[in-house]
Amino acid sequence: GCLTQLYENAFFRGGDVASMYTPNAQYCQMRCTFHPRCLLFSFLPASSINDMEKRFGCFLKDSVTGTLPKVHRTGAVSGHSLKQCGHQISACHRDIYKGVDMRGVNFNVSKVSSVEECQKRCTSNIRCQFFSYATQTFHKAEYRNNCLLKYSPGGTPTAIKVLSNVESGFSLKPCALSEIGCHMNIFQHLAFSDVDVARVLTPDAFVCRTICTYHPNCLFFTFYTNVWKIESQRNVCLLKTSESGTPSSSTPQENTISGYSLLTCKRTLPEPCHSKIYPGVDFGGEELNVTFVKGVNVCQETCTKMIRCQFFTYSLLPEDCKEEKCKCFLRLSMDGSPTRIAYGTQGSSGYSLRLCNTGDNSVCTTKTSTR
Amino acid sequence: IVGGTNSSWGEWPWQVSLQVKLTAQRHLCGGSLIGHQWVLTAAHCFDGLPLQDVWRIYSGILNLSDITKDTPFSQIKEIIIHQNYKVSEGNHDIALIKLQAPLNYTEFQKPICLPSKGDTSTIYTNCWVTGWGFSKEKGEIQNILQKVNIPLVTNEECQKRYQDYKITQRMVCAGYKEGGKDACKGDSGGPLVCKHNGMWRLVGITSWGEGCARREQPGVYTKVAEYMDWILEKTQSSDGKAQMQSPA
């Protein structure tokens, strides 16, 4: 189920799957929610430790049982991922942090009159992930009102420093507030060039596009279909970026599909989940559990309810069935995508719907002049 | 909202505008989306206008002037006014609206979490009131959704300011001693939300007050935590399944 409580002065021991700098516990929780394996997180704010290196440390954690031991740590904040929390699942983070400088690659500097305008510039720049703004009272006059647009390899700051009269925040592209707009087109038989930022296996180009949309550095993608000539590259989804923000070239290529991230869409973003079920397909991965259920939809529901389950295969092989029920293989991987995709099998596969935000999961609850 | 500032897109995605279409169409009240098919508002919004056909509910909007004849809106399937609400009094000023069709959630249209039943222990220090209501006592409806940060006031303090009225435990008050920031006409039914542990909760429903933003006259809101049983009962009995965002 959905667990929203935060534990103050507590740190989860062990289970680390990733770590990063984040400005507060809520942003850390959001990163945990969107990380394929993270179930729990611990955050160390600036006030909680003497150790300068560990300030603003966000630790993403996994546990096979869904729990980890808590150790007392003054100032630390720990909690749960919001996977399975329905409409609370959002990559949108509006907060502006005063007195904080979020470090990264500074790729654009301009003078602006307010931190809001700086945030707007970041939101309207295709490469900007976060920003820092030096206020009117910044100690060095030449830097006052400077708006620094930034990015980093992981989409989070490479360091966070306490610095007076500086304000920082994140791009509001995940809030569907970008003015850039997006390319919805999918280009058949076309491969994009440029830098690959990640490689995952997906059953189709639409899943590839959604993964690209929620990957911090993916601007466009190329997907190699299941009939691509090189067997080892079939179903490969290449997430890509470039200096300019667009592909520098494209090559006509049979059995490839290319397209763009939808992060810059106005007013609406795709849900961060994949609801389609793929008949005749087997998704390979680490086995989490095997259970007998009646029908592929029940298998998907079972996967969705088991928080660590990322994808599933429902087998229709006679030896995997008992009366009306067949084996439902619940699986996971390091990156949330299948480690192998096989075709022509007797059964169907699909993904957990744990990150779908349409769920109604419980979460949280004589008159004078009426108004 | 008096003393407020413009909101931005998706900042208060649960805020809805309750509008009446007679000869002309106008905004009358605010409301809060609490589920795919449920809006929570003030009972007094329906005083003299209990006909559900005349109401149009706009969600996922920021600027009322953007509304055209093509702007999608929700219609009311059922208005559920608290059984103890009386037009002549300020008590039990709470109503549920069941929409004819469920809404999809987006970044600009999603529900607010409800507090735990009888939540009295939580100390809320970051509370906001939002709405398109008047920006002064003798003002007019605002185009852009306004927001204002207002501290909660204890019921004892509030009772001192309203000697002629009974401030019950089912009400919550908010305001500044010096005035200047408050809800006003047209904000009724809208949300008083407080952020606690990183999560927004619907603490109050804008209800009444003496004028707007007057010195030592806080706004009075229906305390949502006190009506959780009623909300659950009505939303569950209506379609057999809880359809609102109750506590974990």
Epitope: R13, G15, Y21, D51, M52, E53, V71, A76 | -
Partner: antibody
């Protein structure tokens, strides 16, 4: 993916010195305490030394105190072990390990593949 | 230093059968509500890997046939059904008292 790669091992005479390195990748190195653990041929595991994330505090087993120095360079994501006055009993495979305990109670959750140090004349 | 004593030193088992390894500490390992007793497995020719931490919490990727239990000074690692891949040396380690110390190891082998 977390990776720890030790290097610098080899054959050294008693009384000699060696400097081991451990190159870390796949995680925010500066957030984690790091440790060296050794294993003499055919024997069990022995904790040798540990260092807090900032490098500001170090710990040593009694058997290596004042002879070994642990250090780290967070800008290079590298852990070091400077070993002086080496003895025959220091012969072992030396592993570096991350510590995700977040507390003074260590927990060695990721280990390198080890580097062999042989002290012999 | 805290002395950790493991028994038996060697444990031959048939595949599919259960196995149990005992670990005893010279002082109580309970502290601030937790017991800082961890189990590691070193497969032949490989580096050690974390199996169980803080008495009973399985590390990521560790099958549920492994479980840890105990209190105070007496601890047990149980394998419900031994598989071929489980062979190797198992070490208990205490992290409650400084310095951290390991048991001498228990070698699990297939009969």
């Amino acid at each position: 993916e977390v990776q720890l790669l030790e290097s610098g091992g080899g054959l050294v005479q008693p009384g000699g010195s060696l400097r081991l390195s451990c190159a870390a990748s796949g995680f925010t190195f500066s957030f984690y305490a790091m440790h060296w653990v050794r294993q003499a041929p055919g024997k069990g595991l022995e904790w040798v030394s540990g260092i807090v994330p900032s490098g500001g505090r170090t710990h040593y087993a009694d058997s290596v105190k004042s002879r070994f120095t642990i250090s780290r360079d967070n800008s290079k994501n590298t852990l070091y072990l400077q070993m002086n006055s080496l003895r025959a009993e220091d012969t072992a495979v030396y592993y570096c390990a991350t510590d995700s305990s977040g507390s003074p109670n260590p927990l060695f959750d990721y280990w390198g593949q080890g580097t062999l140090v042989t002290v012999s004349s | 230093d805290i002395v950790m004593t493991q028994t038996p030193p060697s444990l031959p088992v048939n595949p599919g059968e259960p196995a149990s390894i005992s670990c005893r500490s010279s002082q109580s390992l309970s502290d601030d509500g937790n017991t800082y007793l961890d189990w590691y497995l070193q497969r032949p020719g490989q580096s050690p890997q974390l199996l169980i931490h803080t008495l009973s919490y399985r590390a990521s990727g560790v099958p549920d046939r492994f479980s840890g239990s105990g209190s105070g000074t007496d601890f047990t690692l149980k394998i419900s059904r031994v598989e071929a891949e489980d062979v190797g040396v198992y070490y208990c380690m205490q992290g409650t008292h400084w310095p951290p110390t390991f048991g001498q190891g228990t070698k699990v082998e297939i009969k």
